[in-house]
């Protein structure tokens, strides 16, 4: 008799999930020799242990602690780039500006980037059919809890000037409900972080508005200021030129505003 299976509203676990996580771990340690001490099989076992046989709406940060411990990594605390709704450009930036790091440039962020996963209560099976959706099903699902956990730890580690890249094309440039707005902003440590500098990325070629005056940016400034952290904001009018100038800062066209 086929066992009844819970149908969730979100997509199921990414195909080849175990193989992908293990392969990514091996790749990461090849690319980052300073992480060679990491045993990738143990990392996978800890990852699996966080959600397998557990109800996918009842996952806690505690479930991920063994994985967090294995994935402990020191990144330069003054070289952290946060982002919200503009992941690709943030990653293109750290690919060029090698001394800066997004969460996905760390081992744990790299392992899980763009993946979905969940298990089922009391069975060792991975659910490839469906997983809980944050809005429609539950917020304490394996993926959401993972990102909340690693995002909190990443923000807590930051110091000095922290940068955040924001998408100026969205109706809410700063969204209180995003991971940045709901987790990272509130976990920056005022005793370590001097300034949060927002880079607002413009989408339109002819968009010359000062998006740093946007009401949602003012809201961000207010939240940050109340936490005794200074706030600054820059418009990036030409993201393509911005990246080009990061690559070739000596280019004569890079002295003008980008």
């Amino acid at each position: 008799v086929p066992r009844w299976r819970q149908q969730w509203s979100g997509p199921g676990t990414t195909k080849r999930f175990p193989e992908t996580v293990l392969a990514r771990c091996v790749k990461y340690t090849e690319i980052h020799p300073e992480m060679r001490h990491v045993d990738c099989q143990s990392v996978w076992d800890a990852f699996k242990g966080a959600f397998i046989s557990k109800h996918p709406c009842n996952i806690t940060e505690e479930d991920y602690q063994p994985l967090m411990k294995l994935g402990t990594q020191t990144v330069p605390c003054n070289k952290i780039l946060l982002w919200s709704r503009i992941k690709d450009l943030a990653h293109q930036f750290t690919q060029v500006q090698r001394d800066m790091f997004t969460l996905e440039d760390t081992l744990l962020g790299y392992l899980a980037d763009d993946l979905t996963w969940c298990g089922e209560f009391n069975t060792s099976k991975i659910n490839y059919q469906s997983c809980p959706d944050w809005r429609k099903d539950c917020s304490n699902n394996p993926v959401s809890v993972f990102w909340k956990t690693v995002s909190r730890r990443f923000a807590e580690a930051a110091c000095d000037v922290v940068h955040v890249m924001l998408n100026g094309s969205r109706s809410k440039i700063f969204d209180k409900n995003s991971t940045f707005g709901s987790v990272e902003v509130h976990n920056l440590q005022p005793e370590k972080v001097q300034t949060l500098e927002a880079w607002v990325i413009h989408g339109g070629r002819e968009d010359s508005r000062d998006l740093c005056q946007d009401p949602t940016i003012k809201e961000l400034e207010s939240i940050i200021s109340k936490r005794n952290i200074q706030f600054s904001c820059k418009n990036i009018y030409r993201p393509d030129k911005f990246l080009q100038c990061v690559k070739n800062p000596e280019d004569s066209s890079c002295t003008s505003e980008i």
Epitope: R16, E19, T20, A23, R24, V26, K27, T29, E30, I31, P33, R36, H91, Q95
Partner: antibody, heavy 120, light 107 residues
Framework: EVQLVQSGAEVKKPGATVKISCKVS????????MNWVQQGPGKGLEWMGW????????DVAEKFQGRVTITADTSTDTAYMELSSLRSEDTAVYYC?????????????WGQGTTVTVSS | DIQMTQSPSSLSASVGDRVTITCKAS??????VDWYQQKPGKAPKLLIY???NRYTGVPSRFSGSGSGTDFTFTISSLQPEDIATYYC?????????FGGGTKVEIK
Amino acid sequence: EVQLVQSGAEVKKPGATVKISCKVSGYTFTDSVMNWVQQGPGKGLEWMGWIDPEYGRTDVAEKFQGRVTITADTSTDTAYMELSSLRSEDTAVYYCARTGYNSGYGFPYWGQGTTVTVSS
Amino acid sequence: DIQMTQSPSSLSASVGDRVTITCKASQNVDSDVDWYQQKPGKAPKLLIYKASNRYTGVPSRFSGSGSGTDFTFTISSLQPEDIATYYCMQSNTHPRTFGGGTKVEIK
């Protein structure tokens, strides 16, 4: 069986650009980093750089920066190495290579090599 | 970059002889040294990884040892098919760097 099959020999003029391909089979292309290695005639081996095909992230040895572009096409499971502004000292055999699961960080898998001759 | 100084650059030995090649790293590379064999017109072939681990299918006459900065590669009993150039490579830090190679010939 893991296989890395490279494109054929090339003869180029100084100042030109060459693009070598490395088509893989026998494993999931995005699961491994692809490296490129140069070997001049009668010379030793020199690591040029790598690409993570899953994300397109690359790293190129300082000696080759500005002239080498490494790319990957996940739809065809092929990695590419492009070398521009060719000069006579770029005459060499170029290899793609990757690590394996039971080989530490050594390269058990190599392409057969592509000979590039730069001559006016 | 880490320099890998390999010696000798060439050697000639008789079949059955014990052959030893050394590689010295300019700084500590832990055990992250691999040894390759390359025959003319062919791609290099991995023999030893992580200083002392024989890769799958590699005959037991090939061995490696060392850690830190000093590494040794040994062929316990040289065979005619071992005629080749041997390279060490450090895989501890980017960029990976190779030794200059040792050409092994039969007397």
